[in-house]
């Protein structure tokens, strides 16, 4: 098989591709991000980084490969850089940056029913308990049908 993929130059903001073996069929390019603690992920065609809902758990991607059809896979246009998870999950502080499915909803720190202390403490302190630091985990007791019925009578 001969030929090579085109140089992947229309990259999303802050994404970097390193292609040490060039662009021939079978060659791989490593994905990385220009910013501290950011990760490269795949998003659906019509979703941008600003639009990611908290419940979406995008797939991390480490490389793209030049296929026999002379196309990059995954397509570089679908790869974005997002803030990575900070290593403070399950530490009894609700970290706004980790309060999403991608970071396992901060290991339960943002819901009263799952945080070990049974009291949600936001980080940073300015984080809104009805906003970025709200209980979002769909598996939490707060979101069970039984609890919702209870609230409706309350």
């Amino acid at each position: 098989m001969q030929g090579q993929c085109s140089v992947p130059n229309e990259l999303n903001s802050n994404l970097k591709l390193q292609c040490p073996d060039g662009y021939a069929i079978g060659s791989e390019c490593a994905t990385s991000c220009l910013d501290h603690n950011s990760e490269s992920i795949i998003l659906p065609m019509n979703v941008t980084v600003r639009d990611i809902p908290h419940w979406l758990n995008p797939t991390r991607v480490e490389r793209v490969v030049c296929t026999a059809g002379l196309k990059w896979y995954p397509h570089p246009a679908l790869i974005h850089c997002v803030k990575g998870c900070e290593p403070f999950m399950g530490d009894n502080y609700c970290d706004a940056i980790n309060n999403r499915a991608f970071c396992n909803y901060d290991g339960g720190d943002c819901c009263t029913s799952t945080v070990k202390t049974k009291k949600v403490t936001p980080f940073p302190m300015s984080c809104d308990l009805q906003g970025d630091c709200a209980c979002r985990d769909p598996q939490a007791q707060e979101h069970s049908r039984k609890d919702l019925r209870g609230y409706s009578h309350g």
């Epitope: 802050n14 220009l34 900070e86 290593p87 403070f88 940056i97 980080f123 940073p124 302190m125 300015s126």
Partner: antibody
């Protein structure tokens, strides 16, 4: 208490490479929670971020300086270093090293060295 | 690159005055913004992080507000030791500093 101390030559000739080291005391540079960075301030002007390095060695740079900057870390000496190549008079500044991290300060720079003046002149 | 525009570039005020400094980002940075104080010949000192969280040991007369693109640093009652230059800094994407605001004695 964490302290940072810059060291290196105060005078560098044009076209040469500026080399500075920041020694960290009172804490470990290998802590995974922090980035270690360089900031400069030309005489009478504002602050300019140069770049940062994590304990794992990942580096991040100001796009306008990226082609000339190298930042490295030596965990055994609890130090990190800056190299800026092909310097000109415009690189004359006070150079600061600083720490940033998610905790406790949301990637703000919560600890700084006192700064070292570097003059580029022949 | 994210640009930060501070205003005013300088302000003259008296002890006891309320001083407000603004910082505008060229794009949405959520609350990834910090404020620093710098005195001549000294390194900057962190005052506020995450737009409105007061750094430990900083007097409560300093406060920060805002999110997105518009941010404010307020000194509720200016003290003699507060005459200095103040900088904002974003950490949403790499790092950028604002141009600075010098608070001078009227």
């Amino acid at each position: 208490q964490l302290q940072l101390q810059e060291s290196g030559p105060g005078l560098v000739k044009p076209s040469e490479t500026l080399s500075l080291t920041c020694t960290v005391s009172g804490g470990s540079i290998s802590s995974s929670s922090y980035n270690w960075g360089w900031i400069r301030q030309p005489p009478g002007k504002g602050l300019e971020w140069i770049g940062s390095i994590s304990s794992s060695g990942s580096t991040y740079f100001n796009p306008s300086l990226k082609s000339r900057v190298t930042i490295s870390v030596d965990t055994s000496k609890n130090q990190f270093s800056l190299k800026l190549s092909s310097v000109t008079a415009a690189d004359t500044a006070v150079y600061y090293c600083a720490r940033s991290g998610y905790r406790p300060s949301f990637y703000a720079m919560d600890a700084w060295g006192q700064g070292t003046t570097v003059t580029v002149s022949s | 690159d994210i640009q930060l525009t501070q205003s005013p570039s300088s302000v003259s005020a008296s002890v006891g005055d309320r001083v407000t400094i603004t910082c505008r980002a060229s794009q949405d940075i959520s609350y990834w913004l910090a404020w620093y104080q710098q005195k001549p010949g000294k390194a900057p000192k962190l005052l506020i992080y995450a737009a409105s969280s007061l750094q430990s040991g900083v007097p409560s007369r300093f406060s920060g507000s805002g999110s997105g693109t518009d941010f404010t640093l307020t000194i509720s009652s200016l003290q003699p030791e507060d005459f200095a230059t103040y900088y904002c800094q974003q950490a949403y994407l790499l790092h950028t500093f604002g141009g600075g605001t010098k608070v001078e004695i009227k």
